[in-house]
């Protein structure tokens, strides 16, 4: 697993809709793989974490003055949709093939 | 106070000399980059433009902090700055050098 010592990467995060109270409106699936971005954004920032210029600058400052600024953060930079069967405002079961922004596709340093 | 520690943009002045970039950036000598600081606690405020994934992660963290970490306060919109720099030894002016300063922070 990706602990604080490891580099920014995508790790598994199974989300059960009942656990977060979303089973009241999401009929299916019961759970899904949301993934999570974990790990540190260490200098030098690798190309695969697609750092912005600001993230590079922040990382350089953190390297020289750790108390002045925090490290860049490992976050989702690209999300994927999942398919859900849910109850709409009228309580009618509705299938949404592409329910956007639910699962991590890529992680990066921001 | 929890509200004071909530995700927001804070000042961060960058001196190019301090990070060794004065070797290729001629002007300005530095700039206000800003930084995103603070926590992303549930419920995530609208102005932090949380993604569905960030909301779900915040909820999972709320239920079981061991299972998932909080969403992170990061730049969601960046702005350019103007720079005069050396490009292969040739002095070049770039009116819009993109992605250098934070204009908005959010929870991701």
């Amino acid at each position: 697993s990706a602990g604080a010592g490891s580099h920014c990467q995508k790790t598994s995060l199974r989300v059960n809709f009942e656990d977060i109270g979303w089973d009241s409106w999401i009929i299916a699936p019961k759970e899904y793989e949301a993934y999570e971005c974990k790990g540190g954004c260490f200098f030098p920032l690798a190309d695969d974490v697609t750092p912005t210029k600001h993230a590079i600058v922040q990382t350089l400052v953190h390297l020289k003055f750790p108390t002045k600024v925090g490290k860049a953060c490992c976050v989702p930079t690209k999300l994927s949709p999942i398919s859900v069967l849910y109850k709409d405002d009228m309580g009618v079961p509705t299938l949404k093939y592409h329910y956007e922004g639910m699962s991590v596709a890529e992680c990066g340093c921001r | 106070n929890a509200k004071g520690n909530y995700c927001k943009r804070t000042p961060l002045y960058i001196d190019f000399k301090e990070i060794g970039w004065d070797s290729w950036i001629i002007a300005p000598p530095g700039y206000e980059a800003y930084e995103c600081r603070g926590v992303c606690n549930y419920p995530l405020a609208e102005h932090l433009t949380p993604t569905k994934h960030a909301i779900i992660q915040a909820l999972v963290h709320l239920k079981n902090s061991q299972k998932a970490s909080k969403a992170c306060c990061v730049p969601t919109k960046l702005e350019p700055i103007s720079i005069l720099y050396l490009d292969k030894g040739v002095v070049t002016y770039k009116f819009k050098y993109e992605g250098m300063a934070v204009s908005e922070c959010g929870c991701r």
């Epitope: - | 002007a27 000598p29 530095g30 700055i81 103007s82 005069l84 002095v91 002016y93 009116f95």
Partner: antibody, heavy 115, light 107 residues
């Protein structure tokens, strides 16, 4: 439309401090750079310093440490402060927007240093 | 600092003539040179930016060229309103520096 307007005194006493405000409209100080240029009577243009859009500042070392440039982005104002004025500081002082070249200039403020 | 040497200091011409104004930098400034027109009583007016780019609304009789150290402003068909002072500016190094100016006058 884009406008820059300098406001400041016409007359400043020898050794005193000059303060000029450049108020801009039609553009943002976080997008464009604003520089200060002066022209003494019968002489050429002289660059004084720059307030860059990112908040960085450059000064012409010819003014040593007499010059100070600052801004208030929320009020769309850039400030020039120069102390220990001498008679050869008598000039027309301009603020100008720098994007691709100095494309917009203020009307300038003529400052006379008197003893 | 980069010294910008403008030549000639003054130039006599006739309406309809073609004139060339020169500017020489003491060190290479790439293409970072502008040309300005300064009419007494008015604020300076940008003609050319980045050595050769005509500013919006500037008549096409004004042409800029050059790279490195040598730059020129050409006015292909002088009109009465062009009889004024021209300055070059380099922004390839700090401090930015202007040339001393070229005064264009009628013969």
């Amino acid at each position: 439309q884009v406008q820059l307007k300098e406001t400041g005194p016409d007359l400043v006493q020898l050794t005193q401090t000059l303060s000029i405000t450049c108020t801009v409209s039609g553009f943002s100080l976080s997008t464009y750079n604003v520089h200060w240029v002066r022209q003494p009577p019968g002489k050429g243009l002289e660059w004084m310093g720059a307030m860059w859009n990112g908040g960085g500042i450059n000064y012409n070392s010819a003014f040593k440490s007499r010059l100070s440039i600052s801004r208030d982005t929320s009020k769309s104002q850039v400030f020039l402060k120069m102390n220990s004025l001498q008679t050869d500081d008598t000039a027309k002082y301009f603020c100008a927007r720098f994007g691709y070249g100095f494309d917009y200039w203020g009307q300038g403020v003529m400052v006379t240093v008197s003893s | 600092e980069t010294v910008m040497t403008q030549s000639p200091t003054s130039m006599s011409t006739s309406i309809g003539e073609r004139v060339t104004l020169n500017c020489k930098a003491s060190q290479s400034v790439g293409i970072n040179v502008d040309w300005y027109q300064r009419t007494p009583g008015q604020s300076p007016k940008l003609l050319i930016h980045g050595a050769s780019n005509r500013h919006t609304g500037v008549p096409d009789r004004f042409t800029g060229s050059g790279f490195g150290r040598d730059f020129t402003l050409t006015i292909s068909n002088v009109e009465a309103e062009d009889l004024t002072i021209y300055y070059c500016l380099q922004y390839g190094s700090i401090p930015l520096t202007f040339g001393a100016g070229t005064k264009l006058e009628l013969i």
